[in-house]
Each structure stands twice: as structure tokens, then as C-alpha cells.
């Protein structure tokens, strides 16, 4: 007689990135039985939300539950039936509902309201819409590339199981960069995390971590470009922006009300005597650099070191991933190979940002405009933030992985943020015999 | 002060609908939202649904998906609740009711005299 | 959903003593959570929100306190308009749930 496969004993997570720029929503599954092991969480989905970040919906809050509609009908498919009810349905919200509620906590809190109603509205467990903190983006990144990594498993194998994996139980830092945001994160060497804001203590699988973690809000690629343009306006003598982060030849109006729209442009808001400007690129990946520079303001810091704005950053130490929009912008620049050296990215950036608008949509006409217009000045910050920033050298280059899944996964805080409210992080180590568990990270 | 003054008593056959109907009086519901909670004779509170009128945004406990629907008219003041094919077990009083807030505030501070439905054959 | 547990289903105190009930969520609602009294043939009234604070019109008697799963309402000294049902209910999670109720009863 034939064996009758007995149905699987699985469990399922859903969790939606809502960013600056997009919502993402992420299906993770794993087997029931083994929750409490290492690694054994992986994503079997990714959606993305159609339309803009959810803090875009704040005039129009009406308009959240459809757009939302596309992304949870393919949860439903996918995830079964049965298991519906038992499915934890989380919602985190980063960089860009931070600003809105720096801007108005009652219509930060009125996008939140709808986001709740309109999920509620599906069977499964719905857990809550909320805003993370930085510091929480931050920590579950680094959770998330470190538990896909193996790097809590306490069993060292002789093998690498996973890519970047260097065979020993050293975790590796995160580098998260979003569009309103940018986390670094990670375990220093012996070295006394100066500042309590930036420090965190975990004792995952038995065995405690001291971790300094910093999220930089405006400094995502998005607001720092806007911050860019509020701060090269200033000194500009007509409604002409000659930018140099954008390719020759290119041109885009910009209104003066856009550009003050978000808190991170306060700071360069004057009054000037037009309501509109004109970018026109010129292609310089120097002045580009020098500009950005502007941004980070290296001339104060209460401590022994900092990164930039007088926020203290620990000595750099060990291997680093770098992912969300450092890998995608990097991605597509064609730079994410461990074999181009700091140097060599820089040279291609040189050649990449000189090129002339027109040939650039030529040689890449599948690509959105608005997308495609930015990476000259995405790559440059990544560069520049990495490099003066954080203080990544030609040589601890090398050490910086950029990184768009592990297994399948992607490298993002949301895998991390559901592995901490689902409690499958144990703060000891699982006996191989399942046990009850209640002290979690 | 705002109040709640809901729709009359009501007698419906099993398999019917019926629609309750709840006026603010002394005030708009502004941005607030309105829900709608039931109670069995004998029993305790059930929620069933909540609307913000001023968006027509409506969430459903999952026992009632389907079945309930919730609507509001702002220009009237006056949310609306409907229910179908009515059974026997759906016998109580229906009250609605102001939440106080936004997210995460659904406290209910201002509550309708309540209606009852019996649903008999 | 959270399930909101009330004990016991039944209080009887006689009038001016101290009357206390309980309501545990099945999962940390913080403080999103609120207190009703019900009489015979009224809607409930809000008698607490945010797990401490009084509606308005609130005699001081009535008092909350708890947070996270375990919540207390408790009467200082029971007049004889303070017999009737007690429920609490979490707003932190859609569905709003709500306990089964605590009759206080007149011994």
C-alpha cells in the first residue's frame, strides 16, 4: 500500500514593511514543531504594495483599504485556508510615518486608524499596525541577517552553508538604508557604547550580545536627496539648479512647496522668490560627493568618535551586510560583487554619473524615469555615507557585503520583528527535546 | 453634548434582514467612529462592527463578515446597521455607540438606547 | 482575538463594603482598556478608560488599575446604585472584545 503523506505541520507569519516610499508585505513559513531551532524561518513570499508609502494616504485615508486589497488577496491564496485564523498578521510602519507624526500625531494616528480597520477585515490574527522605532529597525535587521546567516546556531560546521558565511559564530553588522532612514548596526569590539540611547542587550540562545545600533531619520536616500536640493537652492541665483548628481542633459521642474513639505528640509527653508525651480544635471560625481558632504555635519562630537551630527559610532568591527536600497541601488549600478574594490566603485561612479541623460534612458528603457534619474546621486551617498559617514576605509571596503536575500530570505527587519513578537527567539539555547519557554528578547 | 437616538423595536422573520438606524443628536459624529455592539437577552456584549461616517470606512468582527453591513450618511448624522438572513440566535438588543478617538482609542463613551430585534417564525 | 476573561461571573457585597473585580486579556492590551456598568434595561455606561482614568461624571469611588494582561476594578464602598453588571473591554486590537460581565449583587 501506497504511504499517505500526512499533512504538513506548518506554521505561517505575515508581516508588511510599510516604508517611506512603499509597503511590502512578507509571508514567512516554518515547520510547527521546530520553532524555538534556528533558521528555520524562511520567506516563501514577497508582495509589493502597489502605489506609495502609506503616509501619502494622509489626505486621501479612504483610498488605504484598496490599495492594501491586491497584497492580503494573495495572502489569502497562498497561505491555507486552515490556516488562516492562526496566521499573525503584524503591520510595521518606519522613516516616513516618523515624519508624519513629527508633522501631526493626529493624522499620523488617523493613517494608523484605517491601516488597523482595513486589515481587521481579514481572517486572519491581526496583530496591530504601529511605528517602530529606529532603534527596533535597526535591532531586527540585525537579527534578521544574523539569524538567516546561522550565526546564533551554537553548532560550528566545518562547511558554509549560507553565501558571506566565514564559519565562525562573529555576527555580522547591518547597514539598512530605506528613504527616509538609514540604520547601522552592530556588535563592537570591547569597546564601551558611550552613549545608552545607542546601546542594546540581548541574550539570545544563550548567549548575550551588547549591541550599538543608530537610526539616522532624513538620511535615507529619499530625504537626503530633498535635503541636497533645499541646501543647494539656498545659494542658487535664479530658478536654474545646475545639480551635479544628476546625468547631463537632464531636466526636472521641482515646486518650492514639495521641497519644504517634509520636516527634514526645516532646517534650509527660506524664503525664495519663486514657487518653482529647474534642475538641470551636469554629471559630476566630485561636486556630487562634495555636496552630500554638506549634509553631515562632522564638526562636533561629544565623544570619543562619531559618525556624523554628534552621534557617537563605536570603531567599525567585523563583516557587514548592507541591504535594502544599498543593495538595490548597488544592484543595479552593477557594483555588489565582493571583487570591486572601493576605488573601483568610485571610478564607475565617475563614468556612470557623466553620462549623458539621453543615453542613460537609451541603455536602460525599461527603467522608470523618476527611478532611473536618481541613481547617480543614490550611489554617490551610498558612498559618501559609507565612507564619510560611517567611516568604512578603502580597505574595510571589503568588508561590507551587499546583500539582497540569504536562503531565499530577504535581509530587511521584518523576518526579525516577527521571529521577536511570535516568540521564536529563545534567550537560551533550545535542548533538543522542545521545552516550555517564557523569557524572550 | 452629542446623543444616540436609535430606531424602534423590530420583528423579523428567520431568513429576513433588518436595518437599525442610529441619529446623532446635539452634534455630528465628526470624525469619530461609530460602532455597533449586540447583546442577547441574558448575555453579555458582543461587538459587531465599527464605521468612521466621515470616510465610509467599515470593519467587521469575522462572525459577522458577510452578514453585516455597516453604512453611514453624513449629511444626516445617521449611521446604519443591516443584517441578513436572520436567525433566531440573532434576538437582542443592538446598541450603537461613539468611539472617543482614533487609533487605538475605541473606548465607547457615548452610547444609543438600543433596539431590539426578535427574530421569530 | 484577545479573549477577556472576568471574575467571578457573581459579587455579593453588602452595601458600603469594598467590592473588587478582575478582567485578564489573553495577551498584553498595555492600558487600552475600559470599564462599562450595565443596569437592568440601559446601555452600558463608560466608567473607566485607560485602564485608571474616570469618564467624566465618574464618582470617585470607582477606581481601575492594571496593565498589560491583568486589570481591576475596584468599588471603595458600595451604594445601592452601584448593583449591576460590570464589563470590561480591550481597545488595543480590532475586534474589540469584551469580558462576560461581573454582577454585583446585593447580599
Known amino acids: 500500500t501506497q504511504n499517505k503523506a500526512l499533512p504538513e505541520n506548518v506554521k505561517y507569519g505575515i508581516v508588511l514593511d510599510a516604508g517611506s516610499s512603499h509597503t511590502s508585505l512578507y509571508i514567512y513559513k516554518w515547520p510547527a514543531e521546530k520553532e524555538n531551532d534556528t533558521g528555520v524561518v524562511h520567506q516563501v513570499e514577497e508582495c509589493r504594495v502597489k502605489g506609495p508609502g502609506i503616509s501619502k494616504f494622509v489626505q486621501k485615508v479612504n483610498e488605504i483599504g484598496i490599495y492594501l486589497t491586491d497584497c492580503m488577496e494573495r495572502a489569502r491564496e497562498v497561505i491555507p485556508r486552515s490556516q488562516h485564523q492562526e496566521t499573525p498578521v503584524y503591520l510595521g510602519a518606519t522613516a516616513g510615518m516618523r515624519l508624519l507624526r513629527m508633522e501631526s500625531e493626529e493624522l499620523a494616528d488617523r493613517v494608523l486608524d484605517v491601516v488597523e480597520r482595513s486589515l481587521s477585515n481579514y481572517p486572519f490574527d491581526f496583530q496591530g499596525a504601529r511605528i517602530i522605532t529606529g532603534q527596533e529597525e535597526g535591532a531586527y535587521g540585525w537579527i534578521t541577517i544574523n539569524y538567516l546567516l546561522g550565526k546564533f546556531s551554537q553548532k560550528t560546521r566545518w562547511f558554509s552553508i549560507v553565501p558571506y558565511e566565514t564559519n565562525n559564530q562573529e555576527t555580522f553588522g547591518a547597514l539598512d538604508l530605506g528613504g527616509a532612514s538609514t540604520q547601522v548596526t552592530f556588535v563592537p569590539q570591547n569597546q564601551t557604547i558611550e552613549s545608552p540611547d545607542n546601546a542594546l542587550q540581548f541574550r539570545l540562545y544563550g548567549k548575550d550580545y551588547n549591541v550599538y545600533t543608530h537610526s539616522f531619520l532624513c538620511y535615507g536616500k529619499d530625504q537626503a536627496l530633498w535635503q541636497k536640493l533645499a541646501k543647494d537652492i539656498q545659494v542658487a541665483s535664479n530658478e536654474i539648479l545646475r545639480d551635479p548628481c544628476f546625468h547631463p542633459g537632464y531636466k526636472k521642474v521641482v515646486n518650492v512647496s514639495d521641497l519644504y513639505k517634509t520636516p527634514c528640509t526645516k532646517r534650509f527653508e527660506m524664503t525664495l522668490p519663486f514657487q518653482q525651480f529647474e534642475i538641470q544635471g551636469i554629471g559630476n560625481y566630485q561636486q556630487c560627493h562634495q555636496s552630500i558632504l554638506e549634509l553631515f555635519n562632522t564638526s562636533y562630537c561629544p565623544y570619543s568618535q562619531c559618525a556624523f551630527n554628534g552621534i557617537f559610532l563605536p570603531p567599525l568591527q567585523g563583516d557587514f551586510g548592507a541591504f535594502s536600497a544599498f543593495y538595490f541601488v548597488m544592484k543595479f549600478l552593477n557594483l555588489t560583487s565582493e571583487k570591486v574594490s572601493q576605488e573601483k566603485v568610485t571610478e564607475m561612479m565617475k563614468k556612470f554619473c557623466a553620462q549623458p541623460w539621453e543615453e542613460i534612458k537609451t541603455s536602460y528603457a525599461g527603467v522608470k524615469e523618476k527611478y532611473l534619474s536618481e541613481y547617480c546621486f543614490s550611489g554617490t551617498y551610498i558612498l559618501s555615507l559609507l565612507l564619510q559617514g560611517y567611516h568604512f576605509t578603502a580597505d574595510s571596503w571589503e568588508h561590507i557585503h551587499f546583500i539582497g536575500k540569504i536562503q531565499g530570505s530577504d535581509a530587511g527587519w521584518t523576518l526579525g520583528y516577527m521571529l521577536n513578537l511570535t516568540n521564536m527567539i529563545p534567550a537560551e539555547q533550545p535542548l533538543s527535546t522542545p521545552l516550555s519557554h517564557s523569557t524572550y528578547v | 453634548q452629542v446623543q444616540l437616538v436609535q430606531s424602534g423595536a423590530e420583528v423579523k422573520k428567520p431568513g429576513s434582514s433588518v436595518k437599525v438606524s442610529c441619529k446623532a443628536s446635539g452634534g455630528t459624529f465628526g470624525s469619530y467612529g461609530i460602532s455597533w455592539v449586540r447583546q442577547a437577552p441574558g448575555q453579555g456584549l458582543e461587538w459587531m462592527g465599527s464605521?468612521?461616517?466621515?470616510?465610509?470606512?467599515?470593519n467587521y468582527a469575522q462572525k459577522f463578515q458577510g452578514r453585516v453591513t455597516i453604512t453611514a450618511d453624513e449629511s444626516t448624522s445617521t449611521a446604519y446597521m443591516e443584517l441578513s438572513s436572520l436567525r433566531s440566535e440573532d434576538t437582542a438588543v443592538y446598541y450603537c455607540?461613539?468611539?472617543?478617538?482614533?487609533?487605538?482609542?475605541?473606548?465607547?463613551?457615548?452610547w444609543g438606547q438600543g433596539t431590539m430585534v426578535t427574530v421569530s417564525s | 482575538e484577545i479573549v477577556m476573561t472576568q471574575s467571578p461571573a457573581t459579587l455579593s457585597v453588602s452595601p458600603g463594603e469594598r467590592a473588587t473585580l478582575s478582567c485578564r486579556a489573553s495577551q498584553s492590551v498595555g492600558s487600552n482598556l475600559a470599564w462599562y456598568q450595565q443596569k437592568p434595561g440601559q446601555a452600558p455606561r463608560l466608567l473607566i478608560y485607560?485602564?485608571?482614568t474616570r469618564a467624566t461624571g465618574i464618582p470617585a469611588r470607582f477606581s481601575g488599575s492594571g496593565s498589560g494582561t491583568e486589570f481591576t476594578l475596584t468599588i471603595s464602598s458600595l451604594q445601592s446604585e452601584d448593583f449591576a453588571v460590570y464589563y470590561c473591554q480591550q481597545y488595543l486590537l480590532w475586534p474589540l472584545t469584551f469580558g462576560g460581565g461581573t454582577k454585583v449583587e446585593i447580599k
Open positions: 464605521i468612521i461616517p466621515e470616510f465610509g470606512i467599515a
Open positions: 455607540a461613539r468611539e472617543s478617538g482614533t487609533y487605538r482609542d475605541h473606548r465607547l463613551d457615548v
Open positions: 485607560g485602564a485608571s
